[in-house]
């Protein structure tokens, strides 16, 4: 619709012009998280802080139960990092010992399920081997990029080490998305 | 207005739609940090550069003194990525001696200032213990998300040492921010 | 346009607006690299997957033999990941014969190429020492921000060392753009 | 306006030590590290070494590792240099110098005169 | 060491010529290369950085170029005050080392 000009009509159809204040969109901040069942050959889903602080939720984007539920299809932009902190990895003390080894690794992934599909999608990975030599290590993962969703679905963050992630402050472990 | 048929009206009422083209939009990019006063009890400012070669400043997003201005209330993506450099560091020196001890760091923080608001808010924060043991090392952080901002809103990058920023290339260290 | 009410008149002139959902977007996912002539001084480029799984490419966004070509100019935001996996980087076999040394890297470059200009620009550079101790390490290099591209562009994505690229799986080796 | 300030020329004997001060001001003292740079008369420029006048972390070049400390006083935004066994190929003019970056030198000090001679 | 050589390593010239400076590094510094000018008695001046980067305040008559091993400065006019020795720097890694000088005199 560039720079045309109507004249007035009766039957002028519109596009799909949206303001874009009115898209669904979040952005969820890390809490602690309380030890929970998780299923078993996954990575532990993370939980989220979506309405205080840093945190919110709108036009119809909700949060529950781990899960941002998407509420209308289309190109959804998701995004999170995750901060991971540890001790010194077995990795560095094997190494010390002059042997080749398995390096300790982190890993994020965004995953999307889809209740008419049997197995979760991932759409983002991000891993990393650890072989940190100082005692204390710390380190994100970022993760962005666009996917097209279907009204629906729903989005999560799985850590290989829930235990390893910093839940300290609402700016170093987050996770959003908006509908472009 | 998906879709809709519309009657003229005299009265006719439309969404804030607006353009895409005319939203606020920054790409600031890295320049030499030259040794200036900084706040004390917190990280040192990045400033950049906002006109020439990548970078640049449209629709009322200004750059000012080390800070985007935000022009007009709204939901942004904001995001940076912080290239740093250095030489070996004393973790890995102290390393070498056998005792454990606290990692070097380096850190990079998106900060909001509110002019009505005491404190700044701090929206992302990347950090990570460097303990590299090469006789040089460089990595980058990279940070991105969406707030929502109000007119007026500052945002800078912090950076916890400012001396190991890579200044050398604007595509290693840059800052920006748009209106969704 | 923002809440403004309109009288209809025969010479209404609409601002350039357009539905979202007809921009040019891509997200392209790794495939396998195949050993290909590279240029002279320049980083080998990356060849993607454009249709199938995640990936897909949508008005008019296309991609061609390692290029995505931009159909209109316009503000877009370019996003890449790269995953990168290798054996004990020489760095640390050297170190430990008690040497400094140079470190191995890695880097990840996103590239614009445009046919009017000698030399390509790059826009974006994430590149890392790599002085790992472990037998095998990995981990990925992250980019995205927001650039000003003019119809007939062509992005690619160059990598230092393309056999150290981890190609096995679509969420770990992505590279994407869209229309803002 | 950034600023520094070496303390005044010395003559010193062979074997003696000397050291160096400088006084920063107009910037943070402990954001940006604080080099050491001599230049023998008639000759170039030689790196020496640097200190992180915020962790107290040093760096020194081969050649004067064991012979050289470099130090700070962070209340009164001062660092030293000092050199120990001094020779005739010693005689130089010292400076200290600041980055914005730790690898390149900004602002100079205006450089302190160090004669060794018996 | 990296060492850092400069040619030539003095030349004459006169205001409103064009003078080119090179330096070579032993080892690529990607362009961690910096330069500066130094007027006798007096403390060395940041020129460039980067390779190819005006420090600011710099008069845009100076100018970088070069990564990897070879760099150049050329000064596209010179002018009176310009008369003084060039020092290249390579910022790749320690030991920080220096090329040897050019020293720039009037014809």
């Known amino acids: 619709l560039k720079g045309q000009e109507f004249a007035p009509s009766h039957q002028q159809v519109y596009a799909p012009l949206r303001a874009d204040g009115d898209k669904p969109r979040a952005h969820l901040t890390v809490v602690r998280q309380t030890p929970t069942q998780h299923f078993k050959n996954q990575f532990p889903a993370l939980h989220w802080e979506h309405e205080l602080g840093l945190a919110f939720t709108k036009n119809r984007m909700n949060y529950t139960n781990k899960f941002l539920l998407i509420p209308e299809s289309g190109d959804y932009f998701i995004y999170s990092q995750v901060t991971f902190r540890g001790m010194t990895s077995e990795c560095s003390e094997i190494r010390q010992a002059g042997r080749p080894n398995k390096p300790d690794s982190i890993t994020v992934v965004i995953t999307k399920v889809t209740d008419s599909y049997p197995e979760p999608t991932q759409l983002l990975m991000g891993t990393k081997s650890v072989c940190e030599v100082g005692s204390n290590w710390f380190q994100p993962i970022y993760l962005g990029a666009m996917f097209s969703l279907q009204e629906g679905d729903k989005l999560m963050v799985n850590v290989s080490d829930i235990s390893l992630v910093d839940y300290t402050k609402e700016d170093k472990t987050f996770f959003g998305a908006f509908l472009l | 207005l998906k879709g809709q048929e519309f009657a003229p009206s005299h009265q006719q009422v439309y969404a804030p739609l607006r353009a895409d083209g005319d939203k606020p939009r920054a790409h600031l990019t890295v320049v030499r940090q030259t040794p200036t006063q900084h706040f004390k009890n917190q990280f040192p400012a990045l400033h950049w550069e906002h006109e020439l070669g990548l970078a640049f400043t449209k629709n009322r997003m200004n750059y000012t003194n080390k800070f985007l201005l935000i022009p007009e209330s709204g939901d942004y993506f904001i995001y940076s990525q912080v290239t740093f450099r250095g030489m070996t560091s004393e973790c890995s020196e102290i390393r070498q001696a056998g005792r454990p001890n606290k990692p070097d760091s380096i850190t990079v923080v998106i900060t909001k200032v509110t002019d009505s608001y005491p404190e700044p808010t701090q929206l992302l924060m990347g950090t990570k213990s460097v303990c590299e043991v090469g006789s040089n090392w460089f990595q980058p952080i990279y940070l991105g998300a969406m707030f929502s901002l109000q007119e007026g809103d500052k945002l800078m990058v912090n950076v916890s040492d400012i001396s190991l920023v890579d200044y050398t290339k604007e595509d290693k260290t840059f800052f920006g921010a748009f209106l969704l | 346009l923002k809440g403004q009410e309109f009288a209809p008149s025969h010479q209404q002139v609409y601002a350039p607006l357009r539905a979202d959902g007809d921009k040019p977007r891509a997200h392209l996912t790794v495939v396998r690299q195949t050993p290909t002539q590279h240029f002279k001084n320049q980083f080998p480029a990356l060849h993607w997957e454009h249709e199938l799984g995640l990936a897909f490419t949508k008005n008019r966004m296309n991609y061609t033999n390692k290029f995505l070509l931009i159909p209109e100019s316009g503000d877009y935001f370019i996003y890449s990941q790269v995953t990168f996996r290798g054996m004990t980087s020489e760095c640390s076999e050297i170190r430990q014969a008690g040497r400094p040394n140079k470190p191995d890297s890695i880097t990840v470059v996103i590239t614009k190429v445009t046919d009017s200009y000698p030399e390509p620009t790059q826009l974006l550079m994430g590149t890392k020492s790599v002085c790992e101790v472990g037998s095998n390490w990995f981990q990925p290099i992250y980019l995205g921000a927001m650039f000003s591209l003019q119809e007939g562009d062509k992005l690619m994505v160059n990598v230092s060392d393309i056999s150290l690229v981890d190609y096995t799986k679509e969420d770990k080796t992505f590279f994407g753009a869209f229309l803002l | 306006e950034v600023q520094l300030v070496q303390s005044g020329a010395e003559v010193k004997s062979p074997g003696a030590s000397v050291k160096v001060s400088c006084k920063a001001s107009?910037?943070?003292?402990?954001?940006?590290?604080m080099h050491w740079v001599r230049q023998a008369p008639g000759q170039g420029l030689e790196w020496m070494g640097w200190?992180?006048?915020?962790?107290?972390?040093?760096k020194y070049a081969q050649k004067f590792q064991g012979r050289v400390t470099v130090t700070r006083d962070t209340s009164i935004s001062t660092a030293y240099m000092e050199l120990n066994r001094l020779t005739s190929d010693d005689t130089a003019v010292y400076y200290c110098?600041?980055?914005?970056?730790?690898?390149?030198?900004?602002?100079w000090g205006q450089g302190t005169m160090v004669t060794v001679s018996s | 060491d990296i060492v850092m050589t400069q040619s030539p390593s003095s030349l004459s010239a006169s205001v409103g010529d064009r003078v080119t400076i090179t330096c070579r590094a032993s080892?690529?510094?990607?362009?961690?290369l910096n330069w500066y000018q130094q007027k006798p008695g007096k403390a060395p001046n940041f020129l460039i950085y980067?390779?190819?980067r005006l420090q600011s305040g710099v008069p845009s008559r100076f100018s970088g170029s070069g990564s990897g091993t070879d760099f150049t400065l050329t000064i596209s006019s010179l002018q009176p005050e310009d008369f003084a020795t060039y020092y290249c720097?390579?910022?790749?890694?320690?030991?920080?080392?220096f090329g040897p000088g050019t020293k720039v005199d009037i014809k």
């Open positions: 110098a600041v980055g914005g970056s730790y690898d390149a030198f900004d602002i």
């Open positions: 107009g910037y943070t003292f402990t954001a940006y590290y």
């Open positions: 200190i992180n006048p915020n962790s107290g972390g040093t």
């Open positions: 080892q690529s510094i990607s362009s961690y």
């Open positions: 980067g390779a190819s």
């Open positions: 720097q390579q910022g790749y890694s320690s030991p920080f080392t």
